[in-house]
Interface confidence: medium
C-alpha cells in the first residue's frame, strides 16, 4: 500500500524551503529493502531534473524554478522496487500542482487595430473588438484583462467607449461627423488582475476611419443667373453652375445632378455635370426662335447621385435657382422656305405663261420679303424667266421637242433672292416635271401652279437644315451667342453673305 503526500509549488520562486515537496512510502518497506524511482515530465523528460528522489527514503525534492506556463502541473510516476528491480506496488501517479504568479503581461494580438464606422451612427454601435491574451492561469485574476481607453485623438470630446471585459469598442453618442474629423486614434490599455493596481499592462493603438454618408445637402453657388443667347444658335458652354457639397469629394454623396424644374419644356437646354469639379455646364441643344420667344425663366434644382441619408431626409427641401434667359434677335433676312419647290409644265403652256411663284420669306416678320430682287441662277435650256420684284416664274417660250428631250422631261434650276442692304443671297431650287407630248396634250388648258415640295406633296413648311456643331469659350456672367463668340449661326444653308 502506498502512503503519499504532495504539496503544491509556486512558479518563479525558490520552492526549496518546501522540500521535500512530496514523499512516497510503501508499507512493503516494513519487511524488505525498497528502492524508490520516479519518472515523467520534469524528471526524465524535458524539463529534465526538476525533481529528484532520495531512493531510500522516498523524499522528493524540487531543484529549480518551474514555469506554470510550460507545465501547469507535474505528474510524477513513482515506483517501489525490490532488490531484484521488481515492482512491489502498482506504479503510483503523484500530481504536483504549480501555483500561478502574475508573471505574464497581457498581449494584444496586434500593435495597431484598424476599424471603421459610418458618421451619424447611433450611440452604442459596435466599431471593433480588441483581442488580447494573458498566458497566466485561465479563469484567474492574473489573466483577467480589463480594457480602458487612455487617449483619444482628436481629444475634443470622447466619442468611444470600451467594454472593460470584452474589448468591444462602441460609439458613445451619435455625433460622429466625418466633415469635422475623418479619423480617430485611440490608445487602449489592457491590464491584468482585472485592472488592479498590482496588475501588468500592455497598450495598443486603434485607428478608426469615419465613413462618409450623404448627410450634406448640395447647393448651387448662386441662387440666380442671367444669360443672353442669340436665336438660331447652339452653345455647348452657355453657363457654368458650381455646386457646393461638404460630403466626401468625388464620392456619389458629393457628386451633384442638376435638373430642370420648369422652363425647359421645349428641351432647348441640357445640363452636363463635370464629376471632377461638380460644375454643371448649361448647353443649348435646340435653337431658340426670337420671333416665338424673347425671354424665358428656367428653374433648376440639385440633388446628389446617391440617396440622402435618413438623418437629413426631413431637412431636405427642394431649393430652386433661377436662370433668366434673354433671347437676342438676329437680323435673319429673307430665306426661301421651303428651299425647294416642284412645278408642272404642260404641253399647252406657251411664252410668258406663269409656272408659279417662288417668294423669299423675311424671317424677322414671317411675311414675304419686300427688300429683295430675284434673278435666275442655273436655268437649263434657258426655260424660265423670273420677275425680279414678285418672284413670279414664267415660261420664256413654249417647250420644244428638243428641249423636252434634252431635259429628259425633268427640269432642275435655281432662283436667287438678293438683299443688297444685307449683302445676302439666298438660293431656292426649282423642280419642274414637263408633261410628255402626246395626242391629248392640250386637254389641260390651265397653267399648273400648284406648289408642292420635292416629295410631290402639297406645299409644306419643311424646316431649314440646322448645323448643330457648336463651340464656345464664353464664360462671362451675362452670356451672348453672337457669331464668332462661340456660338454657331444656324440660318439655313441656302443663305450666303457677300455681294
Amino acid at each position: 500500500e502506498w502512503i503519499k503526500f504532495a504539496a503544491a509549488c509556486r512558479e518563479g520562486e525558490d520552492n526549496s524551503k518546501r522540500n521535500p515537496i512530496a514523499k512516497i512510502h510503501s508499507d512493503c518497506a516494513a519487511n524488505q529493502q525498497v528502492t524508490y524511482r520516479i519518472s515523467g515530465v520534469g524528471i526524465d523528460q524535458p524539463p529534465y531534473g526538476i525533481f529528484v528522489i532520495n531512493q531510500k527514503t522516498g523524499e522528493i525534492n524540487i531543484t529549480s524554478i518551474v514555469d506554470r506556463e510550460v507545465t501547469p502541473f507535474f505528474i510524477i510516476y513513482c515506483r517501489a522496487l525490490n532488490s531484484m528491480g521488481q515492482d512491489l506496488e502498482r506504479p503510483l501517479e503523484l500530481r504536483v500542482r504549480v501555483l500561478d504568479i502574475n508573471d505574464n503581461p497581457p498581449v494584444f494580438s496586434m500593435a495597431t487595430f484598424a476599424g471603421q464606422i459610418e458618421e451619424n451612427s447611433n450611440a452604442n454601435t459596435l466599431v471593433m473588438i480588441l483581442n488580447a491574451t494573458d498566458a497566466d492561469e485561465p479563469n484567474n485574476l492574473n489573466s483577467k484583462i480589463a480594457f480602458k481607453i487612455i487617449r483619444q485623438e482628436p481629444s475634443d470630446s470622447p466619442m468611444f467607449i470600451i467594454n472593460r471585459n470584452t474589448g468591444e469598442i462602441r460609439t458613445m453618442n451619435n455625433f460622429l461627423d466625418r466633415e469635422q474629423y475623418g479619423q480617430y486614434a485611440l490608445a487602449v490599455r489592457g491590464s491584468d488582475r482585472d485592472g488592479g493596481a498590482d496588475g501588468m499592462s500592455a497598450e495598443c493603438e486603434c485607428n478608426i476611419k469615419i465613413l462618409d454618408v450623404n448627410d450634406n445637402i448640395p447647393y448651387m453657388e448662386q441662387s440666380s443667373y442671367t444669360i443672353e443667347i442669340q436665336e438660331n444658335t447652339l452653345n455647348s458652354n452657355l453657363l457654368e453652375i458650381r455646386v457646393i457639397d461638404l460630403d466626401e469629394e468625388f464620392s456619389a454623396n458629393w457628386m451633384a445632378v442638376i435638373f430642370f424644374i420648369s422652363g425647359n419644356e421645349g428641351n432647348w437646354f441640357e445640363i452636363e455635370m463635370n464629376e471632377r469639379t461638380n460644375v454643371g455646364i448649361l448647353k443649348v441643344v435646340k435653337p431658340l426662335d426670337y420671333e416665338a420667344m424673347q425671354s424665358l425663366q428656367l428653374s433648376i434644382g440639385v440633388r446628389n447621385k446617391a440617396e440622402f441619408h435618413h438623418s437629413i431626409m426631413s431637412q431636405y427641401k427642394l431649393k430652386a435657382s433661377a436662370i433668366s434667359v434673354t433671347v437676342l434677335n438676329v437680323i435673319e433676312g429673307p430665306v426661301f422656305r421651303p428651299g425647294s419647290k416642284t412645278y408642272v409644265v404642260t404641253g399647252n403652256m406657251g411664252s410668258n405663261d406663269k409656272v408659279g411663284d417662288f417668294v423669299a420669306t423675311d424671317l424677322d416678320t414671317g411675311r414675304p420679303s419686300t427688300t429683295v430682287r430675284y434673278v435666275m441662277g442655273n436655268n437649263p435650256a434657258d426655260l424660265l424667266a423670273v420677275d425680279s420684284r414678285t418672284g413670279k416664274l414664267t415660261l420664256k417660250n413654249k417647250v420644244t421637242k428638243e428641249q423636252y428631250n434634252m431635259l429628259g422631261g425633268k427640269y432642275q434650276g435655281t432662283i436667287l433672292s438678293i438683299d443688297d442692304n444685307l449683302q445676302r443671297t439666298c438660293t431656292g431650287t426649282i423642280n419642274i416635271n414637263i408633261q410628255s407630248f402626246g395626242n391629248d396634250d392640250r386637254t389641260n388648258t390651265e397653267p399648273n401652279t400648284k406648289i408642292t415640295t420635292n416629295t410631290g406633296r402639297q406645299e409644306s413648311t419643311s424646316s431649314t437644315n440646322y448645323d448643330t456643331s457648336t463651340t464656345s469659350t464664353d464664360s462671362s456672367q451675362v452670356y451672348s451667342s453672337e457669331p464668332g463668340n462661340g456660338a454657331k449661326d444656324l440660318l439655313s444653308d441656302n443663305v450666303h453673305f457677300g455681294p
Epitope: P47, Y48, V52, T63, S64, I65, E69
Partner: antibody, heavy 127, light 109 residues
Framework: QVQLQESGPGPVKPSGTLSLTCGVS?????????WTWVRQPPGKGLEWIGE???????FLNPSLKSRVTISVDKSNNQFSLKLTSVTAADTAVYYC????????????????????WGRGTLVSVSS | QSVLTQPPSVSGTPGQRVTISCSGS????????VYWYQQLPGTAPKILIY???QRPAGVPDRFSASKSGTSASLAISGLRSEDEADYYC??????????FGGGTKLTVL
C-alpha cells in the same frame, strides 16, 4: 511538434557580417526557453555562442561577445544571430537550439542543456 | 582549446564496455550539473544524460554516467555499431557561460 530551421545568405567575405535567422514552428518563441546558437567548425567540437530569452535577456560567450548580437522577433516567431568582422576561423556549421537554463535552488546546481536542435547550416568565410 | 577536457577518441568491439572521461574545474563541473550529448555522423547533437547521471526517457540503460568532484564520465556497456558517434560533455560555468568538451570520437571495431 516544435521544429527549428536555420536560414541565411550563404558564404560571407572576410571582415563582413554573418547573419542567420532561426524560425520556430509548431510553438511560440515566447515560451519559457532560452533560444541558443551553437557552432561547430568542420571536423571540430561544439562551441556555445550565446542564448536569448523572449524578453530580450541574453547570455553570450565572453570570447565572442564583442562581435555577437542575438535578437528575437516575436511577431515572426524567430530569433537571429549577427557575427561581425568574420575571419576564416568563423567557418562552421551553425546550429540553433532550444535551451533550458534554470538556476538551481540552494544546494542544487544549475540546469543548462538543449533538448531540441535545428539541422544546422554551413557558413563559409572566404574571399 | 576546449574548457572541458575529453579524450579525442576511444574504441571498442561490439559487446564491450567503454568509458569516456570529462575533466574540468570547480566553476563548472564542480558546482553545476553535467550533460552528455551524442552526435551521430551528419546530424545535430541529441541529449544523452542530464543532471550528471540521469537518462532521458528513451535512452537505453546501456548508457550510464557519473560525476565526482570536478570530473565526470560516460560509460557505454554492451557496445553496438549504432553507438559509433561523437560524444560531448557540457556544463554551465558561472563565469564563462556554457562550455563544451572537445568531443570524443567512439569507433566500434
Amino acid at each position: 511538434q516544435v521544429q527549428l530551421q536555420e536560414s541565411g545568405p550563404g558564404p560571407v567575405k572576410p571582415s563582413g557580417t554573418l547573419s542567420l535567422t532561426c524560425g520556430v514552428s509548431g510553438g511560440s518563441i515566447s515560451s519559457n526557453h532560452w533560444w541558443t546558437w551553437v557552432r561547430q567548425p568542420p571536423g571540430k567540437g561544439l562551441e556555445w555562442i550565446g542564448e536569448i530569452y523572449h524578453n530580450g535577456s541574453t547570455f553570450l560567450n565572453p570570447s565572442l561577445k564583442s562581435r555577437v548580437t542575438i535578437s528575437v522577433d516575436k511577431s515572426n516567431n524567430q530569433f537571429s544571430l549577427k557575427l561581425t568582422s568574420v575571419t576564416a576561423a568563423d567557418t562552421a556549421v551553425y546550429y540553433c537550439a532550444r535551451g533550458w537554463h534554470r538556476t538551481g535552488f540552494r544546494g542544487y546546481p544549475s540546469h543548462w542543456y538543449f533538448d531540441l536542435w535545428g539541422r544546422g547550416t554551413l557558413v563559409s568565410v572566404s574571399s | 582549446q576546449s574548457v572541458l577536457t575529453q579524450p579525442p577518441s576511444v574504441s571498442g568491439t561490439p559487446g564491450q564496455r567503454v568509458t569516456i572521461s570529462c575533466s574540468g574545474s570547480s566553476s563548472h563541473i564542480g558546482s553545476n550539473y553535467v550533460y552528455w550529448y551524442q552526435q551521430l555522423p551528419g546530424t545535430a547533437p541529441k541529449i544523452l544524460i542530464y543532471s550528471n547521471d540521469q537518462r532521458p526517457a528513451g535512452v537505453p540503460d546501456r548508457f550510464s554516467a557519473s560525476k565526482s568532484g570536478t570530473s565526470a564520465s560516460l560509460a557505454i556497456s554492451g557496445l553496438r555499431s549504432e553507438d559509433e558517434a561523437d560524444y560531448y560533455c557540457a556544463a554551465w560555468d558561472d563565469g564563462q557561460g556554457g562550455v563544451f568538451g572537445g568531443g570524443t570520437k567512439l569507433t566500434v571495431l
